[in-house]
């Protein structure tokens, strides 16, 4: 049964989906494969802390250690990437803090931008000095393990020299890599000694070997590609928002709720209210009023602006966000001060530092 009673009919008009959702990332912790990662649950007064990854309960194992408010991942792998949450259970309530873990190397071998000028990779030799192939820029080849999110572009580079100028070919898992081996094929830029695969998918996982050879010798270098898949999740609200605010009677105030959702989010601003002098209905559930919601007639639903406030506006304001997967909500309190308590400060005191005058 629902955990509140609506004071009035709040039938919502159909939503006009935005072309792009407002995205505010939760905190992101990045680790390279093989590294250890330690994260502290940023919640206070936790009697019991439970952990989840992508909505699934996380228990200790040979690589995951849970001690108090700390989560330790030893020898991280790309499969440890995902949306994590710690939930602090208290005697009266519970609170959840979300963060992302990204176990990944750089998306490409070397800079993606440097293809505009790859001349330094293409070394011309004096025609008399015959020479077997050699690497000209080993720095761009140091990262062997590449963990890349699905749908991204990958570039592997093997800058080389030699005389005569060596040729380059690529193997996948030790066998000749042919265009028909992947949807959309791949690009080889010989001038830049690079292999480029666009929109990678899980079947692209594997070992990629560049073989550089001329009549005087052959060298090779192997990269390992892991493709990290993402999965849909319920909305995430930026920690600390909306923030508590105070203003004087007659002043203005804004509450801000920043939403991260890769599916259409529906935002509601809700306030606890009284009906017939009571805050609770006959069923014991609190009376709530929807003040604003996302939809056709609602501009910037992430911001709730209150103008010319009265003492009756004081109280708790809830930002509740839902998508087809689930919900999230966070709340803040508005304190309304008598005018004489704040002389000369009648303009807004905003709920977010981003909006301070």
């Amino acid at each position: 049964r629902p955990s509140f009673s609506l004071v009035e009919d709040t039938t919502l008009e159909p939503e006009e989906p935005p072309t792009k959702y407002q995205i505010s990332q939760p905190e992101v912790y990045v680790a390279a494969p093989g590294e250890s990662l330690e994260v502290r649950c940023l919640l206070k007064d936790a009697a019991v802390i439970s952990w989840t990854k992508d909505g699934v309960h996380l228990g200790p194992n040979n690589r995951t250690v849970l001690i108090g408010e700390y989560l330790q991942i030893k020898g991280a792998t790309p499969r440890d990437s995902g949306l994590y949450a710690c939930t602090a259970s208290r005697t009266v309530d519970s609170e959840t803090w979300y963060f992302m873990v990204n176990v990944t190397d750089a998306i490409s071998s070397g800079d993606d931008e440097d293809d505009t000028d790859g001349a330094e990779d293409f070394v011309s030799e004096n025609s008399n000095n015959k020479r077997a192939p050699y690497w000209t820029n080993t720095e761009k080849m140091e990262k062997r393990l590449h963990a890349v999110p699905a749908a991204n572009t990958v570039k592997f580079r093997c800058p080389a020299g030699g005389n005569p100028m060596p040729t380059m070919r690529w193997l996948k898992n030790g066998k000749e890599f042919k265009q028909e081996h992947r949807i959309g094929g791949y690009k080889v830029r010989n001038q830049h000694w690079s292999l480029i695969m666009e929109s990678v998918v899980p079947s692209d996982k594997g070992n990629y070997t560049c073989v550089v050879e001329n009549e005087y010798g052959s060298i090779n270098h192997t990269y390992h590609l892991d493709v990290v898949e993402r999965s849909p999740h319920r909305p995430i609200l930026q920690a600390g928002l909306p923030a508590n605010a105070s203003t004087v009677v007659g002043g203005d105030v804004e509450f801000v709720c920043k939403v991260y959702s890769d599916a259409q989010p529906h935002i509601q601003w809700i306030k606890h209210v009284e009906k017939n002098g009571s805050k609770y209905g006959p069923d014991g559930l609190p009376y709530l009023k929807v003040l604003k919601h996302s939809g056709i007639n609602s501009s910037n639903a992430e911001v709730l602006a209150l103008f010319n406030v009265t003492e009756a506006d004081a109280g708790e304001y809830i930002c509740k966000v839902s998508n087809y997967i689930g919900q999230a909500n966070q709340s803040a309190w508005l304190t309304v001060l008598p005018k004489q308590q704040a002389p000369g400060r009648e303009k807004e005191i905003t709920a977010s530092p981003d909006y301070l005058e």
Epitope: R1, P2, S3, F4, P14, E15, E16, P17, P18, T19, K20, Y21, T52, G55, V56, H57, A151, S231, P232, H233, R234, D262, A263, Q264, S322, N323, Y324, I325, G326, Q327
Partner: antibody, heavy 114, light 107 residues
Framework: QVQLVQSGAEVKKPGSSVKVSCKAS????????VHWVRQAPGQGLEWIGS????????TYNQNYRGRATITADKSTSTAYMELSSLRSEDTAVYYC???????WGQGTLVTVSS | DIQMTQSPSSLSASVGDRVTITCKGS??????IAWYQQKPGKAPKLLIY???YRYSGVPSRFSGSGSGTDFTFTISSLQPEDIATYYC?????????FGQGTKLEIK
């Protein structure tokens, strides 16, 4: 592993009610919506409604508002869908699905016949 | 309600063929589209979500594209095990509506 296990097939009389259960395991029940979808014999899929078990918020397809009631019991990680005033055209397989629609129950066949 | 019009309603193709199914929404749904595969007597199986993201474990021959009102689902090289009915679904606005389905058969 994530599982949604539904109650068994039911045969009901027109005008009566049916209550189908869906027991979830392998994930945090309160962190995802539970959707209910039905499929009449040889027909397509139709969304009935959903519930967010953490607070009991439910949303319905207007075609079923007043006839369908979706509830959830957090203590047993079980969602329920009750359909009242049954008629022959309610004969269908009823599915529950986790919020992301990545996991579905095996389906419950409800037959309405006099 | 947003109507999802799926076409064709049925199609016959040979193993190895490239198969394309389209879905058109009566209103824009950004990229909030999913594609499912359903075999007789079984529950639907999620293949693609958010228009173009392949769900975990789904073979790479399945792909999706599009945004707004027009969406496409493609099987790059049809396999015998792909014989099923395929549905699109918008999950932008309630009620979450499905296309009427495309029954795929082998020639």
């Amino acid at each position: 592993q994530v599982q949604l296990v539904q109650s068994g097939a039911e045969v009901k009389k027109p005008g009566s009610s049916v209550k189908v259960s869906c027991k979830a395991s392998g994930y945090i029940f309160t962190s995802y919506n539970v959707h209910w979808v039905r499929q009449a014999p040889g027909q397509g899929l139709e969304w009935i409604g959903s519930i967010y078990p953490d607070n009991g918020d439910s949303t319905y397809n207007q075609n079923y508002r007043g006839r369908a009631t979706i509830t959830a019991d957090k203590s047993t990680s079980t969602a329920y869908m009750e359909l009242s005033s049954l008629r022959s055209e309610d004969t269908a397989v009823y599915y529950c699905a986790r919020g992301d629609f990545a996991y579905w129950g095996q389906g419950t066949l409800v037959t309405v016949s006099s | 309600d947003i109507q999802m019009t799926q076409s064709p309603s049925s199609l016959s193709a040979s193993v190895g063929d490239r198969v394309t199914i389209t879905c058109k929404g009566s209103n824009g749904v950004s990229n909030d589209i999913a594609w499912y595969q359903q075999k007789p007597g079984k529950a639907p199986k999620l293949l693609i979500y958010s228009a173009s993201y392949r769900y975990s474990g789904v073979p790479s021959r399945f792909s999706g594209s599009g945004s707004g009102t027009d969406f496409t689902f493609t099987i790059s090289s049809l396999q015998p095990e792909d014989i099923a009915t395929y549905y699109c679904q918008q999950h932008s606005t309630t009620p979450y509506t499905f296309g009427q389905g495309t029954k795929l058969e082998i020639k």
